[in-house]
């Protein structure tokens, strides 16, 4: 009889997580009598995966009937593969004894597990930033194997280039994680913008996974303020409006001050949205000119999204208001619109009437 050989025909087998793996092993002789054992890994720390003679291996079944006459096929079937099952599996023949004695090992079959990456999760900055500032977005995906993976960033469909990506761990592992941080420069038109993190992996069959974040969560567009006087009313009342425009988010409190004293406070709510996602709000204040001997200094004070208040003042000259006089003729806009960025639309920063 020929000398026993243990044949593992496949050097490697690749299986998708959740599927089953078949690891093939045949022996060339019925001699010596004794069991087959399957191990993951080699050397003293090897892990027993299947023992023909004894033990309970709920996920492992023998492919052929081990009780079959002349059986020389000791292939096994491992169900519900997970990334933790990756490794090199050895089919080892033992000679029966007390204890059984190892006779010969197969060359080994490397089992690699293809595991899909988790859905990418994109997180933005903890605090809002204004236009022309750079904010960072982070994208994370976990649990994939093999290690090779491609990650791309997009803003409104345009690919971004300013990002850094790390895949961990650097060495061999059963599964891997990816983390990427992209730097995005905000513009005031970004309320409706979106950043997309796209992950491509061999397990996804050309259909990449995407994670998104809305820049609306990251941006603050400070308001423009403009205070104007409307036409003089017949009953000696002056209508002054404070126009608060192009702001985001909606969270805004407006306070009218008359000569430094709080006259009225309002909170913005249920405002219609502009096309670009920003909001406008107009507040009116009726000033009874006849009740004042001196000029009235009106201040529109806006506190937007918890930021320091922005003021715009306007002087109503009482002496210049006979009952028949029209609007604007003797009113002076003395305030400035304090914004923390320049904008081409902002040509009316310092209007005087």
């Amino acid at each position: 009889e020929e000398e026993l050989q243990v044949i593992q025909p496949e050097k490697s087998v690749s299986v998708a997580a959740g599927d089953s793996a078949t690891l093939n092993c045949t022996v060339t002789s019925l001699i010596p009598v004794g069991p087959i054992q399957w191990f993951r890994g080699a050397g003293p720390g090897r892990e027993l995966i299947y023992h023909q003679k004894e033990g309970h291996f709920p996920r492992v079944t023998s492919v052929s009937e081990s009780t079959k006459r002349n059986n020389m096929d000791f292939s096994i079937h491992i169900s519900n593969i997970t990334p933790a099952d990756a490794g090199t599996y050895y089919c080892v023949k033992f000679r029966k004894g007390s204890p059984d004695v190892e006779v010969k090992s197969g060359a080994g079959t490397e089992l690699s597990v293809r595991a899909k990456p988790s859905a990418p999760v994109v997180s933005g900055p903890a605090v809002r930033a204004t236009a022309e500032h750079t904010v960072s977005f982070t994208c994370e995906s976990h649990g994939f194997s093999p290690r090779d993976i491609t990650l791309k960033w997009f803003k409104n469909g345009n690919e971004l280039s300013d990002f850094q990506t790390n895949v961990d761990p650097a060495g061999k592992s059963v599964s891997y994680s990816i983390r990427s941080t992209a730097r995005v420069v905000l513009t005031r038109r970004d309320v409706h913008s979106q950043v997309i993190c796209e992950v491509a992996h061999v397990t996804l069959q050309g259909d990449p996974l995407r994670g998104t974040a809305n820049l609306s969560e990251a941006i603050r567009v400070p308001p423009f303020l403009e205070v104007t006087q409307q036409s003089m009313r017949a009953d000696n009342q002056v209508n002054v409006t404070c126009q608060v425009t192009k702001f985001y988010p909606q969270r805004l409190q407006l306070t009218w001050l008359e000569n430094g004293n709080v006259s009225r406070t309002e909170m913005a709510s249920a405002l219609p949205e502009n096309k670009d996602g920003t909001y406008n709000w107009t507040s009116w204040l009726l000033v009874n000119v006849s009740a004042h001997r001196d000029d009235v200094k009106l201040t529109c004070q806006v506190e937007h999204d918890g930021q320091p208040a922005v003021n715009k003042s306007f002087s109503v000259k009482v002496s210049a208001h006979p009952k028949e006089q029209g609007s604007n003729t003797a009113a002076e806009n003395t305030g400035t619109n304090e914004r923390d960025y320049k904008d081409d639309d902002d040509k009316h920063h310092h209007h005087h009437h």
């Epitope: 009889e1 001699i31 004794g34 003679k53 033990g55 009937e65 009780t67 029966k96």
Partner: antibody
Framework: QVQLVQSGAEVKKPGASVKVSCKAS????????INWVRQAPGQGLEWIAM????????HYNQIFKDRATLTTDTSTSTAYMELRSLRSDDTAVYYC????????????WGRGTLVTVSS | DIVLTQSPDSLAVSLGERATINCRAS??????????IFWYQQKPGQPPKLLIY???NRDSGVPDRFSGSGSGTDFTLTISSLQAEDVAVYYC????????FGQGTKLEIK
């Protein structure tokens, strides 16, 4: 280590039945055939039958086909051999034996159960 | 059915001497490249013990003074140097088809 523990001695009257048990331990019961062999006093070995506990496939010696029935209980790793219509010449030691190499051989043996058939 | 005939029925050999037991099959027991013959030793009051499988392979723990040989229909169990503990009845068995045993050979010390 492999152990096959058989039930105790039985005394039966002619025409009765006997059921001998064989409890296996030290190995995966469903992976190996169990054989039954008997030996009459001062006589040689006589193969009765074999059973595969994984699927209850059986092979019988033609001499015993009509009188012997092999069964297993995988939950307790126990094999049974029932012999019906006992005669005085069925007096023998009945052995169970495990076939380790699926070679239809007998690698490990129980200690035997003496069945005496006498009126 | 294949019938196995052992010879001699009994044998007396001096300690340290060679003992030879023969087993002849009524037809060839060779199949798939193997000779399906097994040898057992049975001591008084004990169950049989497997010595040799597939004609020539010593089972685990069997002393190397025991050897098996032969092919086709004729097989031999040899004890190269008889020891006192080798006194027993020896049986051949085939499994070319369903198993059958030879009638046994009683080995004694001369």
């Amino acid at each position: 280590q492999v152990q096959l523990v058989q039930s105790g001695a039985e005394v039966k009257k002619p025409g009765a039945s006997v059921k001998v048990s064989c409890k296996a331990s030290g190995y995966t019961f469903t992976n190996y055939w169990i054989n039954w062999v008997r030996q009459a006093p001062g006589q040689g070995l006589e193969w009765i039958a074999m059973i595969d506990p994984s699927d209850s496939e059986t092979h019988y010696n033609q001499i015993f086909k009509d009188r012997a029935t092999l069964t297993t209980d995988t939950s307790t790793s126990t094999a049974y051999m029932e012999l019906r219509s006992l005669r005085s010449d069925d007096t023998a030691v009945y052995y169970c034996a495990m076939d380790y190499g699926s070679l239809y051989a007998m690698d490990y043996w129980g200690r035997g159960t003496l069945v005496t058939v006498s009126s | 059915d294949i019938v196995l005939t052992q010879s001699p029925d009994s044998l007396a050999v001096s300690l340290g001497e060679r003992a030879t037991i023969n087993c002849r099959a009524s037809q060839s027991v060779r199949s798939s490249g193997y000779n399906w013959i097994f040898w057992y030793q049975q001591k008084p009051g004990q169950p049989p013990k497997l010595l040799i499988y597939l004609a020539s392979n010593r089972d685990s723990g069997v002393p190397d003074r025991f050897s098996g040989s032969g092919s086709g229909t004729d097989f031999t169990l040899t004890i190269s140097s008889l020891q006192a503990e080798d006194v027993a009845v020896y049986y051949c068995q085939h499994s070319r088809e369903l198993p059958t045993f030879g009638q046994g050979t009683k080995l004694e010390i001369k």
